[in-house]
């Protein structure tokens, strides 16, 4: 029998080892053992949580996130005449979601096939880099959008080229920052072959030396710098925004804006509660437990939290809906299988028949689309 090496490895959650002994499978075939995981990690890697629940959630995210963010990006780039800062941030948000979601078919196949990665090391690194990159990009662009929304209420000045240029500059800086902070994820070997389970994992099993200190320090830094600080800014912007809206005079138009602002705040809050807070909190707790105890009892929660973090790609379109008039129109018409051009023509014909602009609405047999907002 061939002796395995004595290097050590560790499961993403707990202790895995490189066996220095020969390994005989249940079928009696002796093979060289390279990486090994403990019973808990093995049960997770072969269990329904990772092979059924995760692919179901990722399929939902892919089916909802790809078309909605694709449409959003198309609307923001080609169907929005004035490129306000909000539009620029939302376009970047949609792009970040798309860059993450396009890889989901590979992720779904990986989990369905028992956490077995067959697409090579480079694709695994791209998938993981984009996975985390999307989460932190979403947080930062959401922060920019939130601060910008507040700024618009405080400073309701017209659109200026300068503001758009600042927004583009900030967006480029965010992409550069995310690229830099995710470099470690691209550099680290993410694929590990586990002979005992006959699978090659992608990110689910990582070397012990890396896990014990480095991963904890890495995700703690990200949680503080790219989650807590932006979360504080976002929360501040919305608290101040609510104060401003409360104190402002209320006509019908202001009331609609206020309602949309509240819906936006609720959506962003939901995103933080469902997607960003659990994942960032559990990333830190999980790696802290590995560092301090050599094992993580919150592994299942950690997996679920990371999985739920991808739902931001489904929640983001609601943000676009509450912020962008153009996206709202396209979304409504896409859902009603109508082209915007048809609706615009009907609006024109309705107004030409001297219908009041305030109450102008287009009634179809199925629903009514208000066009006066």
């Amino acid at each position: 029998t061939i002796q395995g090496t004595n290097r050590s490895s560790k499961g993403r959650s707990l202790i895995g080892k490189v066996d220095g002994t020969s390994h005989v499978t249940g079928k009696g075939v002796t093979v060289e053992t390279v990486f090994s995981v403990d019973e808990f990690s093995a049960s997770v890697l072969t269990g329904k949580l990772t092979t059924v629940f995760l692919p179901i959630v990722y399929t939902i995210v892919f089916v909802v996130g790809l078309p909605s963010n694709g449409m959003a990006l198309w609307v923001f780039l080609f169907r929005t005449k004035k490129k306000h800062p909000a539009v620029i941030y939302m376009a970047n948000l949609a792009l970040a979601d798309l860059l993450s979601v396009i890889w989901f078919p590979l992720k779904i196949a990986y989990h369905i096939h028992g956490n077995n990665w067959i697409y090579g090391e480079a694709l695994c690194n791209v998938l993981i880099g984009f996975f985390y990159g999307n989460m932190y990009c979403s947080i930062l662009f959401m922060t920019c959008l939130s601060v910008q929304r507040y700024w618009v209420i405080v400073n309701p000045m017209g659109h200026s080229r300068k503001k758009a240029n600042i927004a583009i500059g900030i967006s480029l800086a965010i992409w550069l920052l995310i690229l830099l902070v995710t470099i470690p994820l691209y550099v680290v070997k993410q694929t590990i072959f586990i002979p005992a389970l006959n699978i090659t994992t992608c990110h689910d099993v990582l070397p012990e030396q890396l896990l014990v200190g480095d991963m904890f320090n890495y995700f703690l830094s990200l949680a503080i710098g790219v989650f807590l600080f932006p979360a504080f800014l976002t929360a501040s912007a919305y608290v101040l925004m609510i104060r401003m809206l409360r104190s402002s005079a209320m006509d019908e138009n202001s009331e609609k804006k206020r309602k949309r602002a509240i819906k936006l705040i609720v959506t962003v809050l939901a995103m933080y509660l469902i997607c960003f807070t659990p994942s960032n909190l559990l990333l830190v707790v999980h790696y802290f437990l590995i560092k301090s105890q050599g094992q993580s009892h919150v592994y299942a929660l950690y997996i679920v939290a990371l999985c739920l973090s991808t739902l931001n790609s489904c929640i983001d379109p609601f943000v676009y809906y509450f912020v962008s008039h153009d996206f709202r129109d396209h979304a409504k018409n896409a859902l009603l299988c109508r082209s915007v051009r048809t609706v615009k023509q009907m609006q024109v014909s309705l107004t030409s028949k001297k219908h009041s602009r305030k109450s102008s609405s287009y009634s179809s047999s199925s629903t009514t689309v208000k066009t006066s907002y």
């Epitope: 050590s8 490189v18 499978t25 995981v37 093995a42 012990e208 014990v212 094992q295």
Partner: antibody, heavy 121, light 107 residues
Framework: EVQLVESGGGLVQPKGSLKLSCAAS????????MHWVRQAPGKGLEWVAR??????????YYADSVKDRFTISRDDSQNMLYLQMNNLKTEDTAMYYC????????????WGQGTTLTVSS | DIVMTQSHKFMSTSLGDRVSITCKAS??????VAWHQQKPGQSPKVLIY???NRHTGVPDRFTGSGSGTDFTLTISNVQSEDLADYFC?????????FGSGTKLEIK
């Protein structure tokens, strides 16, 4: 309460065979990896063999000193662990302990009280 | 295989004293070290895992420390029931290996 009770030890002649048993109770036996560890009289502890759970296809591991002579097996329905020892040598004389591996891979967490094997002519 | 060396075969102490038992690994094992206590005529029991974490029910006078290659088990306020053999063990890689043991005695 976790309990591991070994049995089957005794006096055997060199080149003889013997099967040790370990009855497990107080935990979900089929989800844990199990080990045999031995301790020669007045000596230190030596790992002998390991068997994984069904999840990992009952994979088995052996120390070089017992490879091809000892076979570790388990019966999950009976909560039993076994060590079949063939072609015994005098240096196999020791106290044999049945040990549970921590579910999270953190070394061993429970030891049995041991059973004595004496190999002598 | 990784060799675990416990340089002191015996250590003498007085009741109520503090004693430190050391263990050295032949190569880096990270924090994957456990300490086992074996009282005369009994089977071993786990005291410490992952270098510094006490196993369930282990009194807090037992503390483990170290990482890499050097590890220490410290018993503060030694009690009569602590008189036993203490073995370190690495589980960084297979085969798991043990130190030769340190016998704690009363002066």
């Amino acid at each position: 309460e976790v309990q591991l009770v070994e049995s089957g030890g005794g006096l055997v002649q060199p080149k003889g065979s013997l099967k040790l048993s370990c009855a497990a109770s107080g935990f979900t036996f089929n989800t844990y990896a199990m080990h045999w560890v031995r301790q020669a009289p007045g000596k230190g502890l030596e790992w002998v063999a390991r068997i994984r759970s069904k999840n990992v296809h009952y994979a088995t591991y052996y120390a070089d000193s017992v490879k091809d002579r000892f076979t570790i097996s388990r019966d999950d329905s009976q909560n039993m662990l076994y060590l079949q020892m063939n072609n015994l040598k005098t240096e196999d004389t020791a106290m044999y302990y049945c040990v549970r591996e921590d579910y999270y891979g953190s070394s061993y967490d429970y030891w049995g009280q041991g059973t004595t094997l004496t190999v002598s002519s | 295989d990784i060799v675990m060396t416990q340089s002191h075969k015996f250590m003498s102490t007085s009741l109520g004293d503090r004693v430190s038992i050391t263990c050295k690994a032949s190569q880096d094992v990270g924090s994957a070290v456990a300490w086992h206590q074996q009282k005369p005529g009994q089977s071993p029991k786990v005291l410490i895992y992952w270098a510094s974490n006490r196993h369930t029910g282990v009194p807090d006078r037992f503390t483990g420390s170290g990482s890499g290659t050097d590890f220490t088990l410290t018993i503060s306020n030694v009690q009569s029931e602590d008189l036993a053999d203490y073995f370190c063990q690495q589980y960084s890689s297979y085969p798991f290996t043990f130190g030769s043991g340190t016998k704690l005695e009363i002066k």
